[in-house]
Protein backbone atom coordinates (compact mmCIF):
# COMPACT_ATOMS: atom_id res chain seq x y z
CA UNK A 1 0.00 0.00 0.00
CA UNK A 2 1.22 3.39 -1.02
CA UNK A 3 2.55 5.93 2.11
CA UNK A 4 4.07 9.04 2.72
CA UNK A 5 6.69 9.32 5.43
CA UNK A 6 7.43 13.19 6.33
CA UNK A 7 10.82 13.25 7.83
CA UNK A 8 10.99 15.10 9.88
CA UNK A 9 7.69 15.21 11.26
CA UNK A 10 8.04 18.40 13.25
CA UNK A 11 9.77 20.81 11.07
CA UNK A 12 11.16 24.42 12.33
CA UNK A 13 10.54 27.13 10.76
CA UNK A 14 13.33 27.94 8.13
CA UNK A 15 14.11 24.53 7.85
CA UNK A 16 13.38 21.45 5.05
CA UNK A 17 11.39 18.74 4.95
CA UNK A 18 11.22 15.69 2.96
CA UNK A 19 8.03 13.89 1.79
CA UNK A 20 8.98 10.22 1.20
CA UNK A 21 6.74 7.83 -0.99
CA UNK A 22 7.00 4.19 0.72
CA UNK A 23 5.42 1.07 -1.80
CA UNK A 24 5.35 3.11 -5.33
CA UNK A 25 3.42 0.73 -7.84
CA UNK A 26 5.65 -0.98 -10.60
CA UNK A 27 3.54 0.33 -13.79
CA UNK A 28 3.27 4.12 -12.34
CA UNK A 29 4.21 6.92 -15.16
CA UNK A 30 3.49 9.84 -13.13
CA UNK A 31 2.99 11.90 -10.07
CA UNK A 32 1.40 14.71 -8.82
CA UNK A 33 1.39 16.34 -5.21
CA UNK A 34 -1.27 18.29 -3.65
CA UNK A 35 -1.33 20.31 -0.91
CA UNK A 36 -4.18 19.15 1.14
CA UNK A 37 -6.25 15.90 1.63
CA UNK A 38 -7.30 15.52 -1.56
CA UNK A 39 -6.61 15.54 -5.59
CA UNK A 40 -7.92 19.42 -6.47
CA UNK A 41 -6.72 21.01 -9.43
CA UNK A 42 -6.17 24.66 -7.20
CA UNK A 43 -4.31 22.75 -4.64
CA UNK A 44 -1.88 21.07 -7.46
CA UNK A 45 1.97 21.72 -6.14
CA UNK A 46 3.93 20.12 -9.09
CA UNK A 47 3.14 17.54 -11.74
CA UNK A 48 5.93 14.62 -12.94
CA UNK A 49 6.37 12.77 -15.95
CA UNK A 50 8.36 9.96 -15.82
CA UNK A 51 9.02 8.90 -19.19
CA UNK A 52 10.49 13.07 -19.72
CA UNK A 53 11.24 13.50 -16.41
CA UNK A 54 9.68 16.38 -16.91
CA UNK A 55 8.24 18.21 -13.96
CA UNK A 56 5.52 21.10 -13.96
CA UNK A 57 4.65 23.69 -11.62
CA UNK A 58 0.91 23.94 -10.68
CA UNK A 59 -1.38 26.94 -8.87
CA UNK A 60 0.26 25.73 -5.38
CA UNK A 61 3.50 26.04 -6.27
CA UNK A 62 5.67 28.39 -4.29
CA UNK A 63 9.31 28.01 -5.66
CA UNK A 64 10.51 25.73 -2.05
CA UNK A 65 9.18 22.60 -3.79
CA UNK A 66 11.53 20.22 -5.68
CA UNK A 67 10.04 16.82 -6.89
CA UNK A 68 11.89 13.94 -7.25
CA UNK A 69 11.74 10.78 -9.86
CA UNK A 70 11.19 8.43 -6.90
CA UNK A 71 7.90 10.69 -6.02
CA UNK A 72 9.48 12.43 -3.32
CA UNK A 73 8.96 15.98 -2.72
CA UNK A 74 11.44 18.28 -1.05
CA UNK A 75 10.00 21.84 0.50
CA UNK A 76 12.71 23.96 1.76
CA UNK A 77 13.08 27.16 4.02
CA UNK A 78 9.00 25.93 5.80
CA UNK A 79 6.78 28.67 7.11
CA UNK A 80 4.63 28.13 9.66
CA UNK A 81 2.06 27.89 6.47
CA UNK A 82 3.23 25.02 5.14
CA UNK A 83 1.75 22.95 8.04
CA UNK A 84 -1.06 20.25 7.44
CA UNK A 85 -1.58 17.56 4.78
CA UNK A 86 0.16 16.20 1.58
CA UNK A 87 -1.72 13.81 -1.25
CA UNK A 88 0.85 12.02 -3.61
CA UNK A 89 -1.64 10.99 -6.58
CA UNK A 90 0.80 8.44 -8.72
CA UNK A 91 -0.67 8.20 -11.87
CA UNK A 92 -0.64 4.07 -13.40
CA UNK A 93 -0.13 2.75 -16.48
CA UNK A 94 -3.74 1.26 -16.22
CA UNK A 95 -5.03 4.39 -15.51
CA UNK A 96 -6.27 3.38 -11.93
CA UNK A 97 -4.71 6.04 -10.10
CA UNK A 98 -3.53 5.52 -6.58
CA UNK A 99 -3.13 8.18 -3.40
CA UNK A 100 -1.85 8.77 -0.09
CA UNK A 101 -1.62 11.49 2.17
CA UNK A 102 0.91 12.76 4.50
CA UNK A 103 1.51 15.49 6.70
CA UNK A 104 3.89 17.81 8.77
CA UNK A 105 4.18 20.39 11.52
CA UNK A 106 6.00 23.56 11.23
CA UNK A 107 7.17 25.12 14.69
CA UNK A 108 8.76 28.32 14.80
CA UNK A 109 11.97 29.02 15.19
CA UNK A 110 13.25 29.96 18.85
CA UNK A 111 15.06 32.40 19.42
CA UNK A 112 18.15 31.86 21.78
CA UNK A 113 16.94 32.84 25.22
CA UNK A 114 18.25 35.38 27.57
CA UNK A 115 18.15 35.32 31.50
CA UNK A 116 17.22 38.36 34.07
CA UNK A 117 17.92 38.38 37.25
CA UNK A 118 16.60 40.51 39.99
CA UNK A 119 19.90 40.02 41.74
CA UNK A 120 23.20 38.28 40.61
CA UNK A 121 24.77 38.93 44.51
CA UNK A 122 22.43 37.53 46.42
CA UNK A 123 23.24 37.47 50.58
CA UNK A 124 22.59 34.19 52.16
CA UNK A 125 19.92 33.48 54.54
CA UNK A 126 18.46 36.54 53.76
CA UNK A 127 17.72 37.41 50.03
CA UNK A 128 15.96 35.17 47.41
CA UNK A 129 16.58 35.65 43.64
CA UNK A 130 14.44 35.42 40.73
CA UNK A 131 15.69 34.44 37.32
CA UNK A 132 13.35 35.19 34.80
CA UNK A 133 14.11 33.48 30.96
CA UNK A 134 12.99 35.57 27.82
CA UNK A 135 11.42 35.81 25.78
CA UNK A 136 8.01 34.59 26.16
CA UNK A 137 7.20 31.56 23.76
CA UNK A 138 3.33 30.42 23.29
CA UNK A 139 3.39 26.82 22.92
CA UNK A 140 6.83 26.34 24.66
CA UNK A 141 8.55 24.23 27.23
CA UNK A 142 10.82 25.81 29.34
CA UNK A 143 13.45 24.11 31.37
CA UNK A 144 16.48 24.91 33.96
CA UNK A 145 19.50 24.10 34.26
CA UNK A 146 22.21 24.26 37.11
CA UNK A 147 25.62 24.06 36.50
CA UNK A 148 24.59 21.61 33.74
CA UNK A 149 22.64 19.49 35.49
CA UNK A 150 18.96 19.51 35.57
CA UNK A 151 17.45 21.51 38.46
CA UNK A 152 17.73 20.26 41.87
CA UNK A 153 14.18 19.07 43.74
CA UNK A 154 14.38 21.31 46.82
CA UNK A 155 11.23 23.35 48.42
CA UNK A 156 13.29 26.47 48.27
CA UNK A 157 13.12 26.27 44.53
CA UNK A 158 10.27 27.16 42.70
CA UNK A 159 9.11 27.46 39.32
CA UNK A 160 6.05 29.75 38.15
CA UNK A 161 4.56 31.59 35.22
CA UNK A 162 4.98 28.16 32.97
CA UNK A 163 8.71 27.31 34.34
CA UNK A 164 9.64 31.05 32.37
CA UNK A 165 10.46 32.05 36.30
CA UNK A 166 12.58 30.27 38.50
CA UNK A 167 12.77 31.46 42.46
CA UNK A 168 15.55 30.41 44.52
CA UNK A 169 13.78 31.32 48.58
CA UNK A 170 16.54 32.15 51.11
CA UNK A 171 19.42 31.58 48.85
CA UNK A 172 22.05 28.82 50.63
CA UNK A 173 26.00 29.27 49.52
CA UNK A 174 25.36 25.89 47.76
CA UNK A 175 23.20 27.70 45.37
CA UNK A 176 25.81 29.27 44.05
CA UNK A 177 26.65 28.55 39.88
CA UNK A 178 25.65 28.62 36.62
CA UNK A 179 21.98 28.99 35.35
CA UNK A 180 20.81 28.31 31.90
CA UNK A 181 17.47 28.32 30.71
CA UNK A 182 16.38 26.09 27.52
CA UNK A 183 13.27 26.42 25.48
CA UNK A 184 12.07 23.68 23.53
CA UNK A 185 9.26 22.84 21.23
CA UNK A 186 8.60 19.41 19.14
CA UNK A 187 10.88 20.38 16.22
CA UNK A 188 13.83 22.74 18.28
CA UNK A 189 15.55 24.14 21.39
CA UNK A 190 17.50 26.49 22.37
CA UNK A 191 19.56 27.23 25.56
CA UNK A 192 20.75 30.58 26.87
CA UNK A 193 24.12 31.78 27.51
CA UNK A 194 24.52 30.76 31.55
CA UNK A 195 24.09 33.21 34.34
CA UNK A 196 26.58 32.91 37.58
CA UNK A 197 24.70 33.25 40.63
CA UNK A 198 27.31 34.83 43.38
CA UNK A 199 25.97 34.30 47.11
CA UNK A 200 27.57 35.90 49.09
CA UNK A 201 27.89 34.27 52.38
CA UNK A 202 29.44 34.60 56.21
CA UNK A 203 31.78 35.21 57.66
CA UNK A 204 31.33 32.13 59.61
CA UNK A 205 32.28 31.37 63.30
CA UNK A 206 36.33 31.50 62.67
CA UNK A 207 38.57 28.87 63.76
CA UNK A 208 42.04 29.03 65.26
CA UNK A 209 44.40 26.46 64.93
CA UNK A 210 48.08 26.30 65.91
CA UNK A 211 50.49 25.95 63.35
CA UNK A 212 53.95 23.76 63.28
CA UNK A 213 55.62 25.12 66.23
CA UNK A 214 54.64 23.74 68.98
CA UNK A 215 52.06 20.70 67.52
CA UNK A 216 50.93 19.96 70.35
CA UNK A 217 49.82 23.24 71.18
CA UNK A 218 51.63 23.48 74.55
CA UNK A 219 53.20 26.88 74.95
CA UNK A 220 56.17 26.60 77.25
CA UNK A 221 57.90 30.05 77.63
CA UNK A 222 60.25 30.97 74.84
CA UNK A 223 58.34 28.82 72.42
CA UNK A 224 56.74 30.51 68.71
CA UNK A 225 53.01 31.77 69.26
CA UNK A 226 51.88 31.01 65.56
CA UNK A 227 48.24 31.48 65.36
CA UNK A 228 45.85 31.30 62.18
CA UNK A 229 42.54 31.99 61.76
CA UNK A 230 40.28 30.98 59.00
CA UNK A 231 36.47 31.43 58.68
CA UNK A 232 34.53 30.36 55.62
CA UNK A 233 33.19 33.59 53.55
CA UNK A 234 32.54 35.25 49.86
CA UNK A 235 34.35 37.06 49.56
CA UNK A 236 37.25 35.94 51.67
CA UNK A 237 37.20 38.07 54.97
CA UNK A 238 38.48 40.67 56.34
CA UNK A 239 40.84 39.58 59.24
CA UNK A 240 41.71 41.37 62.58
CA UNK A 241 43.40 40.43 65.61
CA UNK A 242 43.67 41.91 69.19
CA UNK A 243 45.41 40.53 72.09
CA UNK A 244 43.88 41.43 75.47
CA UNK A 245 41.68 43.94 73.86
CA UNK A 246 44.42 46.04 72.04
CA UNK A 247 44.26 46.05 68.15
CA UNK A 248 46.59 44.08 66.29
CA UNK A 249 47.80 43.14 62.63
CA UNK A 250 45.45 42.65 59.99
CA UNK A 251 46.59 38.97 59.08
CA UNK A 252 45.14 35.93 59.04
CA UNK A 253 48.25 34.29 60.89
CA UNK A 254 49.30 35.76 64.09
CA UNK A 255 53.24 35.06 64.75
CA UNK A 256 55.02 36.17 67.98
CA UNK A 257 58.21 35.07 68.31
CA UNK A 258 59.69 33.62 71.67
CA UNK A 259 56.53 34.06 73.58
CA UNK A 260 57.27 34.57 77.86
CA UNK A 261 54.27 35.00 80.43
CA UNK A 262 53.72 38.59 79.26
CA UNK A 263 52.14 36.61 76.48
CA UNK A 264 49.35 35.56 78.80
CA UNK A 265 45.74 36.39 77.51
CA UNK A 266 42.99 36.66 75.22
CA UNK A 267 43.71 36.35 71.66
CA UNK A 268 40.88 37.12 69.67
CA UNK A 269 40.12 36.91 65.70
CA UNK A 270 37.48 39.26 64.10
CA UNK A 271 36.55 38.71 60.50
CA UNK A 272 33.88 40.81 58.84
CA UNK A 273 32.44 40.99 56.04
CA UNK A 274 31.26 44.01 54.51
CA UNK A 275 29.17 42.36 51.61
CA UNK A 276 26.86 40.90 53.69
CA UNK A 277 27.36 43.34 56.60
CA UNK A 278 27.93 40.42 58.80
CA UNK A 279 31.01 39.59 61.56
CA UNK A 280 32.07 36.99 63.84
CA UNK A 281 34.77 36.41 66.04
CA UNK A 282 36.68 33.84 68.58
CA UNK A 283 38.45 34.11 71.50
CA UNK A 284 40.98 32.12 72.91
CA UNK A 285 43.17 32.26 76.31
CA UNK A 286 46.31 31.90 76.16
CA UNK A 287 48.60 30.65 79.11
CA UNK A 288 52.70 30.94 79.03
CA UNK A 289 54.39 28.48 81.60
CA UNK A 290 57.52 30.02 82.75
CA UNK A 291 58.63 26.38 84.03
CA UNK A 292 58.59 23.10 82.34
CA UNK A 293 54.84 22.83 83.09
CA UNK A 294 52.80 23.49 79.61
CA UNK A 295 48.91 24.54 80.12
CA UNK A 296 48.86 25.56 76.51
CA UNK A 297 45.51 26.59 74.94
CA UNK A 298 42.68 26.95 76.86
CA UNK A 299 40.18 24.34 75.79
CA UNK A 300 37.10 26.47 76.27
CA UNK A 301 37.21 29.02 73.31
CA UNK A 302 34.63 31.23 73.27
CA UNK A 303 33.09 32.92 70.15
CA UNK A 304 31.21 35.94 69.38
CA UNK A 305 28.63 36.11 66.62
CA UNK A 306 27.86 39.49 65.36
CA UNK A 307 24.90 40.49 62.36
CA UNK B 1 58.73 50.59 61.79
CA UNK B 2 57.87 49.05 58.37
CA UNK B 3 60.32 49.90 55.62
CA UNK B 4 59.84 49.28 52.03
CA UNK B 5 63.04 50.11 50.37
CA UNK B 6 63.48 49.78 46.30
CA UNK B 7 66.31 49.54 44.12
CA UNK B 8 67.99 52.71 42.15
CA UNK B 9 66.23 54.46 38.59
CA UNK B 10 66.85 52.32 36.08
CA UNK B 11 67.62 53.36 31.47
CA UNK B 12 66.53 50.76 29.51
CA UNK B 13 66.33 50.76 26.00
CA UNK B 14 63.02 49.38 23.88
CA UNK B 15 62.75 45.27 23.78
CA UNK B 16 64.86 45.29 27.06
CA UNK B 17 64.01 44.39 30.54
CA UNK B 18 64.09 45.40 33.94
CA UNK B 19 64.43 43.94 37.43
CA UNK B 20 63.60 45.69 40.51
CA UNK B 21 63.97 44.71 43.67
CA UNK B 22 61.59 45.76 47.16
CA UNK B 23 63.20 44.90 50.45
CA UNK B 24 61.00 44.76 53.65
CA UNK B 25 61.70 45.24 57.08
CA UNK B 26 60.37 46.12 60.28
CA UNK B 27 57.05 43.38 60.16
CA UNK B 28 57.27 39.84 59.59
CA UNK B 29 57.89 39.46 55.91
CA UNK B 30 55.60 36.76 55.12
CA UNK B 31 52.44 38.15 56.53
CA UNK B 32 51.44 40.63 53.92
CA UNK B 33 51.01 40.30 50.36
CA UNK B 34 53.38 42.70 48.28
CA UNK B 35 51.70 44.40 45.26
CA UNK B 36 53.18 46.24 42.50
CA UNK B 37 51.56 50.05 40.94
CA UNK B 38 53.11 52.06 38.90
CA UNK B 39 52.67 55.90 37.67
CA UNK B 40 53.57 57.23 34.52
CA UNK B 41 54.89 60.99 34.10
CA UNK B 42 51.61 62.97 35.11
CA UNK B 43 50.06 60.30 34.87
CA UNK B 44 47.48 58.30 37.92
CA UNK B 45 48.01 55.17 39.40
CA UNK B 46 48.13 51.75 37.96
CA UNK B 47 47.89 48.19 39.69
CA UNK B 48 50.21 46.26 37.93
CA UNK B 49 49.89 42.57 40.50
CA UNK B 50 50.68 41.32 43.51
CA UNK B 51 53.06 38.30 45.43
CA UNK B 52 51.78 36.46 48.11
CA UNK B 53 55.48 36.10 50.32
CA UNK B 54 54.64 33.38 52.73
CA UNK B 55 53.51 30.77 48.98
CA UNK B 56 54.87 32.85 46.17
CA UNK B 57 51.42 32.57 44.55
CA UNK B 58 51.40 35.42 41.92
CA UNK B 59 48.26 37.37 40.35
CA UNK B 60 49.15 39.71 37.34
CA UNK B 61 46.90 42.49 36.32
CA UNK B 62 45.84 41.42 32.43
CA UNK B 63 47.52 44.07 30.42
CA UNK B 64 51.01 42.85 32.23
CA UNK B 65 50.32 38.82 31.74
CA UNK B 66 53.09 37.37 29.70
CA UNK B 67 55.86 40.55 30.64
CA UNK B 68 56.03 40.83 34.20
CA UNK B 69 57.33 37.86 36.85
CA UNK B 70 57.04 38.85 40.26
CA UNK B 71 59.48 36.66 42.71
CA UNK B 72 60.61 37.00 46.39
CA UNK B 73 63.55 35.45 48.35
CA UNK B 74 62.12 34.73 51.84
CA UNK B 75 66.02 34.72 53.16
CA UNK B 76 66.57 38.34 52.64
CA UNK B 77 62.37 39.83 52.05
CA UNK B 78 63.22 41.00 48.81
CA UNK B 79 60.85 41.15 46.77
CA UNK B 80 61.63 41.33 42.80
CA UNK B 81 59.14 42.57 39.85
CA UNK B 82 61.03 41.73 35.89
CA UNK B 83 59.23 43.41 33.56
CA UNK B 84 59.97 42.35 29.68
CA UNK B 85 59.56 43.62 26.23
CA UNK B 86 59.57 47.33 27.37
CA UNK B 87 58.62 49.84 25.04
CA UNK B 88 58.39 53.87 25.76
CA UNK B 89 55.29 53.63 27.21
CA UNK B 90 56.75 51.39 30.33
CA UNK B 91 58.72 54.45 31.18
CA UNK B 92 57.40 55.37 34.88
CA UNK B 93 57.89 55.31 38.40
CA UNK B 94 57.19 51.71 40.10
CA UNK B 95 56.14 51.53 43.73
CA UNK B 96 55.82 48.19 45.29
CA UNK B 97 53.39 48.26 48.41
CA UNK B 98 52.24 46.01 51.29
CA UNK B 99 48.88 44.81 51.63
CA UNK B 100 47.14 46.68 54.65
CA UNK B 101 46.13 43.18 55.93
CA UNK B 102 44.83 39.88 54.08
CA UNK B 103 42.32 39.56 51.72
CA UNK B 104 40.37 42.85 50.57
CA UNK B 105 42.89 45.20 51.76
CA UNK B 106 44.09 47.95 50.53
CA UNK B 107 48.02 49.41 50.73
CA UNK B 108 49.14 50.94 53.51
CA UNK B 109 52.83 51.20 53.32
CA UNK B 110 54.83 52.32 49.53
CA UNK B 111 58.36 51.72 48.58
CA UNK B 112 60.02 54.96 47.55
CA UNK B 113 59.54 54.30 43.64
CA UNK B 114 62.26 53.58 41.37
CA UNK B 115 61.90 55.47 37.85
CA UNK B 116 62.64 53.42 34.72
CA UNK B 117 62.97 54.92 31.64
CA UNK B 118 62.98 53.44 28.57
CA UNK B 119 64.23 55.38 25.84
CA UNK B 120 66.26 54.26 22.28
CA UNK C 1 37.43 44.87 35.32
CA UNK C 2 36.01 47.33 37.40
CA UNK C 3 36.02 50.90 36.26
CA UNK C 4 36.77 53.85 39.18
CA UNK C 5 35.89 56.70 37.68
CA UNK C 6 36.31 60.18 39.76
CA UNK C 7 35.14 63.54 39.29
CA UNK C 8 36.23 66.22 39.66
CA UNK C 9 39.40 66.22 38.36
CA UNK C 10 40.86 69.15 39.66
CA UNK C 11 39.74 71.24 41.83
CA UNK C 12 40.53 74.85 43.34
CA UNK C 13 39.27 75.86 47.32
CA UNK C 14 40.29 77.90 49.76
CA UNK C 15 41.39 77.53 53.05
CA UNK C 16 38.95 76.28 55.57
CA UNK C 17 36.33 75.05 52.31
CA UNK C 18 34.68 72.51 52.58
CA UNK C 19 35.75 69.84 49.79
CA UNK C 20 33.84 67.02 48.14
CA UNK C 21 35.39 64.59 46.15
CA UNK C 22 33.36 61.78 44.50
CA UNK C 23 34.32 58.14 43.22
CA UNK C 24 32.01 55.89 41.20
CA UNK C 25 32.45 52.35 40.69
CA UNK C 26 31.55 50.16 37.39
CA UNK C 27 30.08 47.44 39.93
CA UNK C 28 28.70 46.92 43.20
CA UNK C 29 31.74 47.49 45.59
CA UNK C 30 30.34 46.60 48.91
CA UNK C 31 32.07 49.78 50.66
CA UNK C 32 35.83 47.98 49.92
CA UNK C 33 36.89 51.46 48.85
CA UNK C 34 40.21 53.09 49.55
CA UNK C 35 40.95 56.80 49.72
CA UNK C 36 45.01 58.09 48.86
CA UNK C 37 46.56 61.43 49.11
CA UNK C 38 49.65 61.85 46.64
CA UNK C 39 51.85 65.02 47.46
CA UNK C 40 53.85 66.61 44.41
CA UNK C 41 56.91 64.22 44.16
CA UNK C 42 55.91 62.02 47.21
CA UNK C 43 54.54 58.31 47.65
CA UNK C 44 51.02 57.81 48.16
CA UNK C 45 49.72 57.76 51.57
CA UNK C 46 47.05 55.82 52.47
CA UNK C 47 44.46 57.72 54.45
CA UNK C 48 40.67 55.72 54.52
CA UNK C 49 40.09 52.19 53.59
CA UNK C 50 36.43 50.02 54.16
CA UNK C 51 34.96 53.47 52.80
CA UNK C 52 35.02 55.40 55.91
CA UNK C 53 37.63 53.55 58.09
CA UNK C 54 40.29 56.55 59.03
CA UNK C 55 43.97 55.26 59.22
CA UNK C 56 45.34 55.90 62.12
CA UNK C 57 47.21 59.43 62.23
CA UNK C 58 45.20 60.92 59.54
CA UNK C 59 43.72 64.04 60.27
CA UNK C 60 40.04 63.87 61.32
CA UNK C 61 38.95 66.28 58.98
CA UNK C 62 38.69 63.63 56.42
CA UNK C 63 36.12 61.63 56.22
CA UNK C 64 34.93 58.76 53.78
CA UNK C 65 31.18 57.76 53.06
CA UNK C 66 29.05 56.02 50.05
CA UNK C 67 28.22 53.10 49.59
CA UNK C 68 27.17 50.09 46.71
CA UNK C 69 29.00 52.31 43.55
CA UNK C 70 28.91 55.60 44.75
CA UNK C 71 31.83 57.12 47.44
CA UNK C 72 32.61 60.59 48.75
CA UNK C 73 36.21 61.72 50.36
CA UNK C 74 34.85 64.93 52.05
CA UNK C 75 37.86 67.36 53.29
CA UNK C 76 35.75 69.37 56.06
CA UNK C 77 38.04 72.25 56.42
CA UNK C 78 41.19 72.64 53.82
CA UNK C 79 44.28 73.24 54.68
CA UNK C 80 47.52 74.48 52.76
CA UNK C 81 48.89 70.90 53.49
CA UNK C 82 46.31 69.51 51.66
CA UNK C 83 47.26 70.02 48.94
CA UNK C 84 47.84 66.97 46.72
CA UNK C 85 46.06 64.51 44.22
CA UNK C 86 43.45 61.99 46.03
CA UNK C 87 42.69 58.84 44.37
CA UNK C 88 39.95 56.27 45.33
CA UNK C 89 40.81 52.67 44.61
CA UNK C 90 38.07 49.33 45.07
CA UNK C 91 39.64 46.83 47.52
CA UNK C 92 37.59 44.05 46.77
CA UNK C 93 39.91 41.01 45.41
CA UNK C 94 42.06 41.74 42.59
CA UNK C 95 42.49 43.03 39.79
CA UNK C 96 42.72 46.70 42.07
CA UNK C 97 41.82 49.58 40.14
CA UNK C 98 42.26 53.37 40.76
CA UNK C 99 39.99 56.31 39.99
CA UNK C 100 42.21 58.79 37.43
CA UNK C 101 42.70 61.03 40.53
CA UNK C 102 41.74 64.61 41.55
CA UNK C 103 44.50 67.38 42.19
CA UNK C 104 43.03 69.89 44.85
CA UNK C 105 44.75 73.43 45.29
CA UNK C 106 44.42 76.46 47.44
CA UNK C 107 42.74 79.66 45.43
Known amino acids: KLTIESTPFNVAEGKEVLLLAHNLPQNRIGYSWYKGERVDGNSLIVGYVIGTQQATPGPAYSGRETIYPNASLLIQNVTQNDTGFYTLQVIKSDLVNEEATGQFHVYPELPKPSISSNNSNPVEDKDAVAFTCEPEVQNTTYLWWVNGQSLPVSPRLQLSNGNMTLTLLSVKRNDAGSYECEIQNPASANRSDPVTLNVLYGPDVPTISPIISPPDSSYLSGANLNLSCHSASNPSPQYSWRINGIPQQHTQVLFIAKITPNNNGTYACFVSNLATGRNNSIVKSITVSASGTSPGLSAGAHHHHHH | QVQLVQSGAEVKKPGASVKVSCKAS????????LHWVRQAPGQGLEWIGY????????SYAQKFQGRVTMTRDTSTSTVYMELSSLRSEDTAVYYC?????????????WGQGTLVTVSS | DIQMTQSPSSLSASVGDRVTITCRAS??????LAWYQQKPGKVPKLLIYNYKNLVEGVPSRFSGSGSGTDFTLTISSLQPEDVATYYCQHHLGTPYTFGQGTKVEIK
Open chain 3, 27 to 32: ENQYGY
Open chain 2, 51 to 58: INPQTGYT
Open chain 2, 26 to 33: GYIFTSYW
Open chain 2, 97 to 109: AREYGNYNYPLDY
